[in-house]
C-alpha cells in the first residue's frame, strides 16, 4: 500500500513567491514621471518576474519632519490621486499582482516616526489600515521600527485590525537591527508578521558564517513562516560583493519562507549606477535611454532589456528562480534541513512529502572546491541519492540536465547549483 | 472653505444624556478626523475626542466611560452624546476638524445641566 | 496625559509693543505644538503649528519659537485686534492637551 500523503499546509499568497518593493517610484520608471498611472505601466514586468507582491511606496502626504503635514489618509499630489491608486488596484489584481501599501510616516524626513516618539502618529496608523483596506490594498509595511516606542504592542493592534478584516491581509515590519534576540522579541508577539531585516548582511559572506546565522534562525523561530532580504530597503548590491550576488538570489528564493526584494535586484543595479541620483532613489535601467551618462557599450547588459535578452543574464536567473519557487511543492512549504558544510559552502536540501526533492550547493569561496555532500545528519525522510540533476547553476557552461555525482561535486568560485532528485519510497 | 456648525438642546438635566450633532458643509467628512472639544465657564479647552469616517473613534480617558461620538457620511455630519451628565458638564461644545491640530472650528454651542 | 502649563493667566501690553506667551509641556512634545487665539463670542482661531509654522492667513507679526518642553508664541508690533485669549496645544500624545490659556489686555 502506497504511504499516505502528507496534509498540505495552509498557504496564504506572500508563502508561493517573492515580494517586490517599489520605494521610490521616480527611481523605478526612471523617465521623471514618477506617478501611479505609470507604474500601471510595469505591471506586466513584475508578471514576468512571477513576484506575488508589490511593496508600494510610501505614497501619502509627508512634509519632512512635520507631524501636522503628514496625512496617511490622503496620496502625495505628486504621486496621483485616489483614483490613480484604485486603478493601479485593480490592473494588479487581474494580473494576481497584491499590492502591499508602506505606511511609514515621515519617510522624507530624517527619523521615519519623527524625532520624538509621536504618539498620535501610532495611533492614526491605524485608523490608515482601516481606510486602505476598505480601498482594497493586500497588505501594509512600517520601518524603522525600532524607532517606535512599545512597536511590539503598536504592531499587535495593527496585526489585529489586518488580521481581523482578513486573514489574507498582511503587514510587514521593517527593521535595521541585525540583533537575533531583537528581532525574535519583536516576532514573539506578532504571529504571522513578516519581519525585514539587515540579520542576513551582518554575515562575513562565509559559507560557514551564513549557514549559521540561517539555522539559528530557523530553529529560533520554529514553525513560524519567515522572510528573507538582506534588509528592510535597499539594493543587494549596496550589501553584497557584486560576486555573490547570483549566490544570494539562489539562496533567497530556495530558504523556506518568503524572498523580499528591491526594484533592480533582478538586474545588480546598483545605488549609485547614474551619477548625481541620490543613493536612495536609484535609478531603475529599463534600456540604454536611462542613463545618458554611461556609454552605450558597455551599458546593454546591465539593463532590463539588454539582460532579457541574454539566458545567461541576473535577470533571466531571477526569473527561473521565480518560476521554481511559484511552483515547486518543497519549495514551496518543504522541510529544511542542512548540510555538513566546510568553511567556503553552505548545503540544504528541500523535500516535501513524496514531491520532488531540492538540492542547493553555494560555494562562497574565491576559489573553486570539491564538495563531497554528506546525508549523515539528515532524517531518513530526506536521504540523499548518489546522482541528482542539475536544474540550474548560478554560472553559465553547465550541461543543465544533467546527472551529477554528490560524492565528486565540483563548484567555481561563488558558483551556486539547484538540483533536484525524486522522492525514492 | 469648510464650515462646521453646532446644533442641539441648550439645557439638559442632569443624569441625562447630552446630545449634539455637527453638520460639515463645503467639504466632505469623509478622509479627515472630526473632534469635539469644550470650554466649561472660565475654564480652559478639553479636547472630548475624535471620530474618522470608518467609524473609528479615540476618546480622552477621562470622559471615555460616558462618550460615544458617531458618523453619518450620508448627510456630513456627526454627533456627540455624553451620558450622567452633571453640573460640570455644563460649557460651550466646539465641534472642529482634526489635523492633530484644530484648523476648522464650529461656532460653538452653550449647553447648561440644570434641573 | 501631558500637561500644558501657560502660567500668565494675564499679559498687558500697548499697541506697537512686542509680546511673548509662553507654554510648556510636562513632558518632552518635540515641536507637535499649536497655537491659538480666541475671542469673546467666537471660536478659537489656529495661528501656529508644528511650533513655528504659521496658519494661513495669519499675521507675519505671530511668530512661534521652541521645541522639547518650552514653546513661546511671539507677537511683534502688537494691533488692538490681538486683544484675545491664546491657548497652547500639544499633538504629540493622546488626549491631545491645551494650556489653561494667557488673556491679553491692551494698556
Known amino acids: 500500500r502506497a504511504p499516505r500523503c502528507r496534509d498540505l499546509p495552509v498557504q496564504k499568497w506572500w508563502h508561493t513567491g517573492a515580494l517586490y518593493r517599489i520605494g521610490d517610484l521616480q527611481g523605478f520608471q526612471g523617465n521623471g514621471a514618477g506617478n501611479l498611472a505609470g507604474l500601471k505601466g510595469h505591471l506586466d514586468y513584475l508578471s514576468s518576474l512571477k513576484v506575488k507582491g508589490l511593496v508600494l511606496g510610501p505614497i501619502h502626504k509627508n512634509q519632512k519632519d512635520d507631524v501636522a503635514g503628514t496625512d496617511l489618509l490622503q496620496i502625495d499630489p505628486n504621486f496621483g490621486s485616489k483614483e490613480d491608486f484604485a486603478s493601479l488596484l485593480q490592473s494588479a489584481k487581474k494580473k494576481s499582482i497584491r499590492i502591499i501599501l508602506d505606511l511609514t510616516p515621515n519617510y522624507q524626513g530624517e527619523n521615519s516616526w519623527f524625532s520624538t516618539q509621536v504618539d498620535t502618529v501610532a495611533t492614526k496608523v491605524k485608523d490608515a489600515l482601516e481606510f486602505w483596506l476598505q480601498a482594497g490594498v493586500d497588505g501594509f509595511q512600517v520601518r524603522d521600527i525600532e524607532n517606535l516606542k512599545d512597536a511590539s504592542s503598536f504592531l499587535a493592534e495593527w496585526q489585529n485590525i489586518t488580521k481581523g478584516f482578513s486573514e489574507d491581509r498582511l503587514l510587514i515590519a521593517g527593521t535595521n537591527s541585525s540583533d537575533l534576540q531583537q528581532i525574535l522579541s519583536l516576532l514573539e508577539s506578532n504571529k504571522d508578521l513578516l519581519l525585514t531585516s539587515s540579520y542576513l548582511s551582518n554575515s562575513s559572506f562565509t559559507g560557514e558564517h551564513t549557514k549559521s546565522l540561517v539555522t539559528q534562525y530557523l530553529n529560533a523561530t520554529g514553525n513560524r513562516w519567515c522572510s528573507w532580504s538582506l534588509s528592510q530597503a535597499g539594493l543587494l548590491t549596496s550589501f553584497l560583493p557584486a560576486q555573490l550576488l547570483r549566490l544570494y538570489q539562489l539562496m533567497l528564493f530556495t530558504l523556506p519562507g518568503t524572498p523580499v526584494f528591491s526594484y533592480g535586484d533582478e538586474i545588480g543595479l546598483e545605488a549609485a549606477a547614474v551619477p548625481g541620483q541620490p543613493v536612495e532613489a536609484p535609478v531603475m535601467l529599463w534600456d540604454e535611454s536611462s542613463f545618458p551618462f554611461i556609454s552605450a557599450a558597455g551599458s546593454a547588459n546591465m539593463t532590463v532589456k539588454g539582460q532579457s535578452e541574454d539566458p545567461g543574464s541576473l535577470l533571466s536567473l531571477f526569473r527561473r528562480l521565480s518560476d521554481q519557487r511559484s511552483k515547486e511543492r518543497s519549495l514551496l512549504h518543504g522541510d529544511f534541513h542542512a548540510l555538513s558544510s566546510g568553511p567556503g559552502f553552505f548545503s540544504y536540501i528541500r523535500h516535501w512529502d513524496q514531491n520532488e526533492r531540492f538540492l542547493v550547493v553555494l560555494n562562497f569561496g574565491d576559489v573553486g572546491l570539491s564538495a563531497g555532500l554528506q546525508a549523515s545528519d539528515l532524517p531518513a525522510s530526506a536521504s540523499l541519492p548518489a546522482k541528482a540533476d542539475l536544474l540550474l547553476s548560478t554560472q553559465p557552461g553547465r550541461d543543465e540536465g544533467s546527472p551529477l555525482e554528490l560524492e565528486r561535486l565540483k563548484l567555481e568560485p561563488h558558483e551556486g547549483l539547484l538540483l533536484r532528485f525524486p522522492y525514492v519510497a | 472653505q469648510v464650515q462646521l456648525q453646532e446644533s442641539g438642546p441648550g439645557l439638559v438635566k442632569p443624569s441625562e444624556t447630552l446630545s449634539l450633532t455637527c453638520t460639515v458643509s463645503g467639504g466632505s467628512i469623509s478622509s479627515s478626523y472630526w473632534s469635539w472639544i469644550r470650554q466649561p465657564p472660565g475654564k480652559g479647552l478639553e479636547w472630548i475626542g475624535y471620530?474618522?469616517?470608518?467609524?473609528?473613534?479615540n476618546y480622552n480617558p477621562s470622559l471615555k466611560s460616558r462618550v460615544t461620538i458617531s458618523v453619518d457620511t450620508s448627510k456630513n455630519q456627526f454627533s456627540l452624546k455624553l451620558s450622567s451628565v452633571t453640573a460640570a458638564d455644563t460649557a460651550v461644545y466646539y465641534c472642529?476638524?482634526?489635523?492633530?491640530?484644530?484648523?476648522?472650528w464650529g461656532q460653538g454651542t452653550l449647553v447648561t445641566v440644570s434641573s | 496625559d501631558i500637561v500644558m502649563t501657560q502660567s500668565q493667566k494675564f499679559m498687558s501690553t500697548s499697541v506697537g509693543d512686542r509680546v511673548s506667551v509662553t507654554c510648556k509641556a510636562s513632558?518632552?512634545?518635540?515641536?507637535?505644538v499649536a497655537w491659538y487665539q480666541k475671542k469673546p463670542g467666537q471660536p478659537p482661531k489656529a495661528l501656529i503649528y508644528?511650533?513655528?509654522y504659521r496658519y494661513s492667513g495669519v499675521p507675519d507679526r505671530f511668530t512661534g519659537s521652541g521645541s522639547g518642553t518650552d514653546f513661546t508664541l511671539t507677537i511683534s508690533n502688537v494691533q488692538s485686534e490681538d486683544l484675545a485669549e491664546y491657548f497652547c496645544?500639544?499633538?504629540?500624545?493622546?488626549?491631545?492637551?491645551f494650556g489653561s490659556g494667557t488673556k491679553l489686555e491692551i494698556k
Open positions: 471620530i474618522y469616517n470608518s467609524g473609528s473613534t
Open positions: 472642529a476638524r482634526e489635523t492633530y491640530y484644530f484648523d476648522y
Open positions: 496645544q500639544q499633538y504629540n500624545s493622546y488626549p491631545l492637551t
Open positions: 508644528s511650533a513655528a
Open positions: 513632558q518632552n512634545v518635540g515641536i507637535n
